[in-house]
């Protein structure tokens, strides 16, 4: 299953399959997730080690048993790959690292006014993998405001150095935010020239293209089909790059297929997994396990559940079957691709779905109309769980926010439905940033069921929580995916990085905003919060957030939206925007419904009709 916990001051001994430099443990975990053999990782922050060569070291590890002995090492951080973690699997990494220089091949230098602009340049440059930016206070005047675009053979820095007034980060191409755009075309009977960066075996050009998309240096590819004239080159997928970023030449060639990486696509990237099953094909590799199962789909499920399994072959040979069950060969290799592909067999083959980010049809967990004041514009894909709840009567208008918590579930505030309990009048927009982008052609979800907490009473602040079941399940993308829920009764976690988002008023007597707003707000203890509200009881089912001096808060139209906190690299839905005394007033924190206190209720209500809990727990 999915394991998200991080181990502080611990280092996994042995099992090394690769090492690299990464700026933090979360990026190291992401590299582990996408490495075909990595199950565990250990990261050494700069503060944890004196050896300059090992600072920022990210060590990727494998283990036959799925675990390794942990040794105490002050400052080290260890954890698990996020394979099997559904929607948490993403190559997108937005963080910017202050005081850090990520070294690599500097291929472009320009003057820019901010680190955000530098990151944008990197994202819009086909070869840029990461960047460094010298701020206005950098010690050497001639380097100030320099934006250095970089790449390296492995896509990670060749070294990371602590350096004042330098900020570094990664390209946002894996976030589907590139302005470059991509070539979806597949070119039959055409071979591209240029530099081969890797060679793998794949059953078709589509798998080849997905592997190219997620390979750090692949810009385009050529695939040799299973009828290619040279037998030893059949099913070979050549991953390629060039100085210019495009093929310098292409040659008409029978039984070859070429195409481009889809990393530069805007708004949608392919999933980092291959779900197709190939009948009459055997995939060769190192044997992990053999089990008898009923049908090829069960074989694929078995492979997906066994975390080390990369691909499988389901044999229909009479000697491999007994009754309705046949042998399911679970296999792996060094690069995650078959070492041999044979056609015309009595088998069916395919890949593990451990890196698919759709997951199951579940909601995600780990073991007064209010409002954004003092916020800033959000960017695409920053808060992919945020939805807009709109009402269409004569005109259509945004009324509340909500949070996507599963393919078919949205969590919001009960008071959003005060006076409007009819499900037909509601339209739910997901995967959007600007309300002005909504036209009559914009797809929206309709409500199948509104479930208001049984103890909620109109115009009271208590139990302000509601679930919405959508008529049809939503697919997950970089711009539309769920937020994880906290553990039941989560009281021990101290959240220090919390954000509220919404399209609500930007001042107390304002209007709905066009661009989704975000504001970083500290949590306030319930005891402190209670002292600020002389007439209302702040219960343990509420959580408060706000600045002593005011100025930043949620406001009208943000109700029902998320209060999310980042902990150990993972965002969790801590609160639902509920009520407050005005907006952003001094000494009047916003009051949010505490989601952890309603976990039993959420789980009970999101049970599917067959009684299977629609929850997926990464803890």
């Amino acid at each position: 299953g999915c394991l998200t916990q991080l181990y502080e001051n611990a280092f996994f001994r042995g099992g090394d399959v690769a090492s690299m430099y990464t700026p933090n443990a979360q990026y190291c975990q992401m590299r582990c997730t996408f490495h075909p053999r990595c199950l565990l990782f250990s990261f050494l922050p700069a503060s944890s080690i004196n050896d300059m060569e090992k600072r920022f070291g990210c060590f990727l590890k494998d283990s036959v048993t799925g675990t390794l002995p942990k040794v105490h090492r002050t400052g080290a951080v260890s954890g698990h790959s996020l394979k099997q973690c559904g929607h948490q699997i993403s190559a997108c990494h937005r963080d910017i690292y202050k005081g850090v220089d990520m070294r690599g091949v500097n291929f472009n230098v320009s003057k820019v006014s901010s680190v955000e602009e530098c990151q944008k340049r990197c994202t819009s440059n086909i070869r840029c993998q990461f960047f460094s930016y010298a701020t206005q206070t950098f010690h050497k005047a001639e380097y100030r405001n320099n934006c250095l675009l970089k790449y390296s053979p492995g896509g990670t820095p060749t070294a990371i150095k602590v350096l004042s007034n330098v900020e570094s980060g990664f390209s946002l191409k894996p976030c589907a935010l590139s302005e470059i755009g991509c070539h979806m075309n597949i070119f039959q009977h055409l071979a591209f020239s240029d530099v081969d960066v890797a060679r793998v075996l794949t059953p078709d050009a589509f798998v080849c293209r997905t592997i190219c998309t997620y390979h750090p240096n692949c810009l385009f590819f050529t695939f040799y089909t299973n009828v290619w004239k040279i037998e030893s080159q059949r099913n070979v997928c050549l991953l390629k790059t060039s100085e210019s970023g495009t093929p310098s030449s292409s040659t008409p060639q029978e039984n070859t297929i070429s195409g481009y990486s889809l990393l530069t696509c805007k708004r949608t990237l392919p999933e980092p997994c291959h779900s197709k099953i190939y009948p009459g094909v055997d995939f060769g590799g190192e044997e992990l396990n053999v089990t008898f199962v009923k049908g090829v789909n069960v074989c694929q499920e078995t492979c997906t559940k066994m975390i080390r399994c990369q691909f499988f072959t389901y044999s229909l040979l009479p000697e491999d079957c007994k009754e309705e069950k046949c042998k399911c060969f679970l296999r792996l290799s060094m690069d995650g691709s078959p070492t041999r592909i044979a056609y015309g067999t009595q088998g069916s083959s395919g890949y593990s779905l451990r890196l698919c980010n759709t997951g199951d049809n579940s909601v995600c967990t780990t073991k007064t109309s209010t409002r954004i004041v003092g916020g800033t514009n959000s960017s695409w894909g920053e808060w992919p769980w945020q939805v807009s709840l709109q009402v269409k009567l004569t005109a259509q208008r945004h009324l509340c926010g909500g949070s996507l918590i599963g393919h078919q579930w949205v969590l919001t505030a009960a008071h959003c439905f005060d006076g409007l309990p009819l499900q037909d009048v509601w339209r739910i927009y997901s995967g959007i940033l600007n309300l002005s982008d909504i036209t009559k052609d914009t797809p929206f979800s309709q409500i199948k069921e509104i479930i208001i907490h049984q103890n909620y009473k109109v115009s009271e602040g208590n139990h302000d929580i509601a679930l919405i079941k959508l008529q049809a399940p939503l697919n997950y993308t970089e711009f539309q995916k769920p937020i994880c829920l906290p553990s039941k009764g989560d009281t021990s976690t101290i959240y220090t990085n919390c954000w509220v988002t919404g399209w609500g008023f930007s001042k107390e007597k304002g209007e709905i905003q066009n661009i989704l707003q975000k504001v970083n707000i500290p949590l306030v203890t319930n005891e402190e919060c209670q002292k600020r509200y002389q007439d209302y009881k702040i219960t343990q089912r509420m959580v408060c957030a706000g600045y002593k001096e005011g100025g930043k808060d949620a406001c009208k139209g943000d109700s029902g939206g998320p209060l999310v906190c980042k902990h150990n690299g993972m965002w969790r839905l801590v609160g639902i925007t509920s009520w407050g005394e005005g907006c952003a007033r001094r000494e009047q924190p916003g009051v949010y419904t505490k989601v952890a206190e309603y976990m039993d209720w959420i789980l009970e209500k999101t049970q599917s009709s067959d009684g299977k809990a629609q929850m997926q727990s990464p803890a």
């Epitope: 209670q530 002292k531 002389q534 007439d535 209302y536 702040i538």
Partner: antibody
Amino acid sequence: EVQLQQSGAELVKPGASVRLSCTASGFNIKDTYIFWVKQRPKQGLEWIGRIDPENDNTKYDPKIQGKATLTADTSSNTAYLQLSSLTSEDSAIYYCAKGGGLFAYWGQGTLVSVSA
Amino acid sequence: DIQMTQSPSAMSASVGDRVTITCEASHDINNYIAWYQQKPGQPPKLLIYYTSTLQSGVPSRFSGSGSGTDFTFTISSLQPEDIATYYCLQYDNLFTFGQGTKVEIK
């Protein structure tokens, strides 16, 4: 309209106990705290304690711990103050009040006279 | 325990006068002070909370100020209906009332 109706005056003997009631209307006591405050004749105000009727959590002034017991019955929307081992020092008006961080709305008070 | 020392215990002033009452806390109470008005035969009424926030429906002639341990309650222009006893209350740590100030008209 928010109202707190307190029980009538009590004349009790030293050493006895008394139970005062405070019945709420216009709101549900589960959604608030009920506070009790004592005011001796011609004297100031003293906080006795607070109850959260939703879960019966109580807080008392440490100086009077043991003298007072706070309870609530959510079905009748009523809070109670029980005073035990009464002495002349306990002769006072006892107020119930509702609120969150503070006592925002008050009952009319109940006079308790302790006399042999 | 936090003690609240209120002064004066009684005062008389003319209609239209500015009236000032002070409260001193034995510890810093983080501005968590409220002021109540009590008229004879009635329960107290909340006027001000969190040092200076006026409870809704309370006339603007009532105000509060201060920080740390020293706080002031002011009636900018005394009216006949303001004759009452005024109490300060700290609510930073449990609840403690001041001894009260009786305001009379000269």
